[in-house]
Structure formats: C-alpha cells, structure tokens
C-alpha cells in the first residue's frame, strides 16, 4: 500500500441545517475499491450505520427518513476497500431547527436605515438561551453567533452594525440555542427585511470591519462591528 | 461476563407471528450492534438482520426485509427479533449474537458471542 | 450475495490428529473472514477472525490462514472438547454469509 487511503467525502441532502421531522439523506463518497461505507457518530462507541456501497461503489446513502433530536450531531465517514480503512472524512455537523419556540428579530431604531449609520438587530427569546444565531439568506457563510459566558442565559442578544452599507441589506433570522446541545436550533423567527437606502456617499467599511473583497459581497460573512452590548455574551465568527 | 439470554421456545401456526427476546448483560448494550441468526434443522447459519442499539438504525437481509422486523429497549437491555407470516420453512433455531470491534487496530469486527438460540417451530 | 462453500462436510479424525478445514468465497472477501465452533448443544463460540486472529481465551491449538477467495482452518491436535461443527463466515459486505458447515467426530 503507498499511503494510506484518501478520505471521503460526507454531505447532507438537501441539507446539513434540518427542521424537525424532514428527512435528510447522508452521502460518503469514497472511491470505487470500497467494499463498505460506514458512518461514525460523534461520543457514540458502536459505528453509527453502516451500509453496502451503491453501484459503481464509489458512494453509500444513509438514510434519515424523520429528523429528531437524537439525529443532530457530528458525523464522519469511512469506507473500506480490499486494503483497508479510509482515512475519516472531514466533519458534517448536522443540525436541527425546530428544538424550542421561534424568538423574534427587530432592527432598532428601524429596520429602514440609511447607509453610513448604525442599526442594531435584535434577537429575543420567551425563554431564556444562552447561544443565540443571526442568519443572512444567500450568504455563503451566513452564522454568527453570540453564546453566553458561564452559561449565564439571557432572553436576547442584540447585533449592532455600524457604519451599515449597502452590503448588509437583505433578508435575516434568527434562531435560539442552548449550550449543551449546538445542533439543536429553535424555530427561525420570523424574516427581517433589512433595507439600506443610499446616501452620497457610501462609507467603505474599515478592514478590521469587513473581510477581503475578493469575493462578492453575499460570500462574506456578516461582520457586525463594535463592542458586544450584552454582558455575558461573546462573539463566536462561524 | 457477556451473556446473551434468549427466551424460550415456541410452536406457531402458520401465518402467525413470533417474536424472540434476548436479554443482554456484562457489557454496555448500547455499545454494540446486535445480530440476529438462524439455523433450520440439519442446515447451515443464515443471517437475518442487525441493529445498533443506540440509535435503532437496521439493516436487514433482503430474503426477510418484509417480514422481520428488530426492535430494542435500552431500558432493560433486551433485542428482540419478529418474523411474521410464519411458514413452515421458517422453523429453525433463533440466535442473537453481539456484533463489535476486535483487536486494537480499526476495522476488525465480528460476531463474537452468542445468546443459547430459542427454537421456533411451525406447524399446522 | 457472496457464496461460502466449506469442506469437507464431515469428517472423523482420532485424538491428535490434525484437522483441516477449507473455506472458498464466490468473490475476494479480502481476509474478512471468520470461524466458529457450534457444539452439539447449539452454543456457538468465535474461534478466529479476520482469517488468521485468534479470539480471546481460544486454545492455541486453533490457526486460520488464507487470503483472496481460499480459506484455511487447522486444529492442530484435535481434543475429545472439540467435538464440534464448525463454519467459516464472511464479513466483508453485506449481508453476513457463512458456509454451510464441517462436522468434526472423534474415530
């Protein structure tokens, strides 16, 4: 053998995010030598599943046919071919919504702002949390997270955007969280539409604000400036 | 020390149902997949299914996909294994048998203990 | 499925004697291959897995060897306690297959 075998790929379909009761389609695609896929559950001793290859082989479908708290989690994939064992694949971290109730987002003072000024968003819960999770629609890397400090629970996180560019308009959500479990999300609150009208002149966010320009403005991660309003609360950048 | 404990033996009409417990002790239940086997009179082993207990994930030999089916309950450590539409051919002696990793290194699992097997016999 | 054709169906050896067993498989299992012993009451105990490995607390006296699609199994010096049938079984894809059987008696 010449090294050892190169890792699998792991993907969730249609996704890795799943709302209570969907069902989600696991994939390990390994090479055409493999003679069995087996999926392997973060803190669980036994392997996960384990399935026979699909025709050509080169791939195995584990199937959830109705997502539930027990299904969230950290998986990985390997496969077997007449060698030996693959090398694990990288992580799939697959999540649930739909755990707790849908807290509620508003912008303060307006979800209307004008370019160059601040708005704050802000997440509420019903019941206290401690991680809470702001979601931009078509972004390439959409959380950000503000957990809690020494499991201090909180019933809201508030993120500010300032200066605000044309870059941070669109569609928001929210989710709520608990600490114990990171892959149990609560319902997403209801859709913000955050809308930024121009002004003369577009403020050009400072680099320690705003990542490489790169790539486009909706593959940037949101990047909400200033100090954390919450005490207790920390900025977590997924 | 693993022990597999099966429950005793049965005499079924055809048609009917049966359903075959093992209760398992010595060993974290849920740290192993469970097998399930059986032996018709005078012939050789052929396997039927397995479950991980932890999670209840399945897989099944397609010759009894629509007919076996294998639960658990963590709660008393116990497998069970129910054949419907009981035919006469389906006489035969019933195994669980835990299934794990052996040896140090990755990959190596097999079968490595075995409940007494509870004989089921169909007959009109 | 993969098929496992073990012989000899019987045979009768004398205390001492070495025992040979064979085990072919319609395709490449790649050495995930196992032995086990079911004595005459119906318990069933592991002997050897993965072709050559012996399962804890298994008598020495015991050795597998093999690889590809042709398997061994070899008692060294068959004991009156080894009175047994025994069968190969494949674990390389599913679903498990095992071959149909040797039963060893004492002449």
């Known amino acids: 053998q010449a090294g050892p075998l190169p890792k699998p790929t792991l993907w969730a379909e249609p996704g890795s995010v799943i709302s209570w009761g969907n069902s989600v389609t696991i994939w390990c695609q390994g090479t055409l030598e493999a003679r069995e896929y087996r999926l392997d559950k973060e803190e669980s001793p036994a392997p996960w599943d384990r399935q026979n290859p699909l025709e050509p082989k080169n791939k195995a479908r584990f199937s959830i046919p109705s997502m539930t708290e027990d299904y969230a989690g950290r998986y990985r994939c390997y496969y077997r071919s007449p060698v030996g064992w693959s090398q694990p694949s990288d992580p799939l971290e697959l999540v649930m919504t739909g755990a707790y109730s849908k807290p509620t987002l508003s912008a303060l003072p307006s979800p209307l702002v004008t370019s160059g000024k601040s708005v704050t968003l802000l997440c509420q819960s019903r019941s206290p949390m401690d991680t809470f999770l702001l979601i931009k629609e078509r972004a390439a890397h959409p959380l950000l997270h503000l957990r809690s400090e020494h499991g201090a629970q909180q019933h809201q996180a508030e993120f500010p955007m300032s200066p605000v560019t044309s870059v941070h308009g669109g569609t928001y959500r929210c989710f709520s969280s608990h600490g114990f479990s990171h892959y149990l999300l609560s319902h997403p609150s209801d859709p913000l539409e955050l809308i930024v009208s121009g002004s003369l002149e577009d403020p050009r966010p400072s680099p320690t604000r705003s990542v490489s320009t790169a790539a486009g403005p909706e593959d940037q991660p949101l990047m909400p400036t200033g100090s954390v309003p919450h005490s207790g609360l920390r900025r977590h950048w997924e | 020390q693993v022990q597999l404990v099966q429950s005793g033996a049965e005499v079924k009409k055809p048609g009917a149902s049966v359903k075959v417990s093992c209760k398992a002790s010595g060993y974290t239940f849920t740290n192993y997949w469970m097998h399930w086997v059986r032996q018709a009179p005078g012939q050789g082993l052929e396997w039927i299914g397995e479950i991980n207990p932890s999670n209840g994930r399945t897989n099944y030999n397609e010759k009894f996909k629509t007919r076996a089916t294998l639960t658990v309950d963590t709660s008393t450590s116990t497998a069970y294994m129910e054949l419907s539409s009981l035919r006469s051919e389906d006489t035969a002696v019933y195994y669980c048998?835990?299934?794990?990793?052996?040896?140090?290194?990755?990959?190596?699992?097999?079968?490595?203990?075995w409940g007494q097997g509870t004989l089921v016999t169909v007959s009109s | 499925d993969i098929q496992m054709t073990q012989s000899p169906s019987s045979l009768s050896a004398s205390v001492g004697d070495r025992v040979t067993i064979t085990c072919r498989a319609s395709q490449d299992i790649s050495n995930y291959l196992n032995w086990y012993q079911q004595k005459p009451g119906g318990a069933v105990k592991l002997l050897i897995y993965y072709t050559s490995r012996l399962h804890s607390g298994v008598p020495s006296r015991f050795s597998g060897s093999g690889s590809g699609t042709d398997y061994t199994f070899t008692i060294s010096s068959l004991q009156p306690e080894d009175i047994a049938t025994y069968f190969c079984q494949q674990g390389n894809t599913l679903p498990p297959t095992f071959g149909g059987g040797t039963k060893v008696e004492i002449k």
């Open positions: 048998a835990r299934w794990g990793q052996l040896g140090l290194r990755e990959g190596y699992y097999a079968v490595d203990y």
